[in-house]
């Protein structure tokens, strides 16, 4: 089995208030089975940004069709960026578990920061 890796290619993403930001994340394996979630921050206080299996995230859309059985692209777009959105975003793979899924591997994170306003 190829060991799963979480790839977040950008360490830093400069964004503009009011625009849409794209956060990239790809995986190198579909196994073990389990969902991919996006968080801002780390530790117990981290904020859930997107959960592929449930929830309502009105500002978040996926770049790829996650219903494809061979999908390895879990990149997301966040619309209408505000200063409150800055922080470091992590895509995290969970493996199935009972009663709760278990965190399996995290990407290295992408820091979202505000860039200069266009003149």
């Amino acid at each position: 089995e190829e060991e799963l890796q979480m790839i977040q290619p950008e360490k830093l993403l400069l964004v503009t208030v009011g625009k849409t930001a794209t956060l990239h994340c790809t995986v190198t394996s579909l196994l073990p089975v389990g969902p991919v979630l996006w968080f801002r921050g780390v530790g117990p206080g981290r904020e859930l940004i997107y959960n592929q299996k449930e929830g309502h995230f009105p500002r978040v859309t996926t770049v790829s069709d996650l219903t494809k059985r061979n999908n390895m692209d879990f990149s997301i777009r966040i619309s209408s960026i505000t200063p409150a959105d800055v922080g470091t975003y992590y895509c995290v793979k969970f493996r199935k578990g009972s009663p709760e899924n278990v965190e399996f591997k995290s990407g290295p994170g992408t820091e979202m920061a505000l860039g200069a306003k266009p003149s």
């Epitope: 073990p32 089975v33 299996k53 069709d65 219903t67 059985r69 061979n70 009972s98």
Partner: antibody, heavy 118, light 107 residues
């Protein structure tokens, strides 16, 4: 309420074709992968084919690959199964089913009966 | 292939367990589907190993470990008489499979 209603079943002769339809309502059809499952008389359930939400990716069991084609029209909230070169072994009730995020099934249609007989 | 017992029986109020083996925990999710008569629409009672749809009574529960899944009905009722199919999705092959079905008789 989620509703899936199949149609298009009937009696056909071996070698003929049939196109099944599944009309979906009560949910955002374009956000869900869908599948077709059949049940032959006195037998168990058999998954046949699945299709991604956008319709670009399709998956089949080996025994129907090249003979059956799954497709969808998200503008019509409809799922289809084109069945060619039918044989008596294709006689069954055909169900459409909505997939969960991990490709199991949460809602099923009532089914449509296909009989292949000479 | 998924293997499940052909039949199980129980008295009302008893606990029933139906097992399904043949999948790989690393790559497989399981579901359980109830069919009350042949040719009638199946009803999903468990998906994602242990997730119960909101309209399914709490006496139905599911679990998975190793290469097997288990459907448990705690306090079985006469109306639970049906054939129960286990199903699996394999993330290696992208294929869904079903067991042959278990007929539950409530005495």
């Amino acid at each position: 309420d989620v509703q899936l209603v199949e149609s298009g079943g009937g009696v056909v002769r071996p070698g003929e074709s049939l196109r099944l339809s599944c009309a979906a309502s009560g949910f955002t059809f374009s956000s869900y992968a869908m599948s077709w499952v059949r049940q032959a008389p006195g037998k168990g359930l058999e998954w046949l084919a699945g299709i991604s939400a956008g319709g670009s990716d399709t998956y089949y069991i080996d025994s129907v690959k090249g003979r059956f084609t799954i497709s969808r029209d998200n503008s019509k909230n409809s799922l289809y199964l084109q069945m060619n070169s039918l044989t008596a072994e294709d006689t069954a009730v055909y169900y459409c089913a909505r997939e969960t995020w991990n490709h199991l099934f949460d809602y099923w249609g009532l089914g449509t009966l296909v009989t292949v007989s000479s | 292939a998924l293997t499940q017992p052909a039949s199980v029986s129980a008295n009302p109020g008893e606990t029933v367990k139906i097992t399904c083996s043949g999948g790989d925990y690393y790559s497989t999710y399981y579901g359980w589907y109830q069919q009350k008569s042949p040719g009638s629409a199946p009803v999903t009672v468990i998906h994602s190993d242990d997730k119960r749809p909101s309209d399914i009574p709490s006496r139905f529960s599911g679990s998975a470990s190793g290469s097997a899944a288990t459907l448990t009905i705690t306090g079985v009722r006469v109306e639970d008489e049906a054939v129960y199919f286990c199903g699996a999705y394999d993330g290696r092959t992208y294929i869904n499979t079903f067991g042959a079905g278990t007929t539950l008789t409530v005495l």
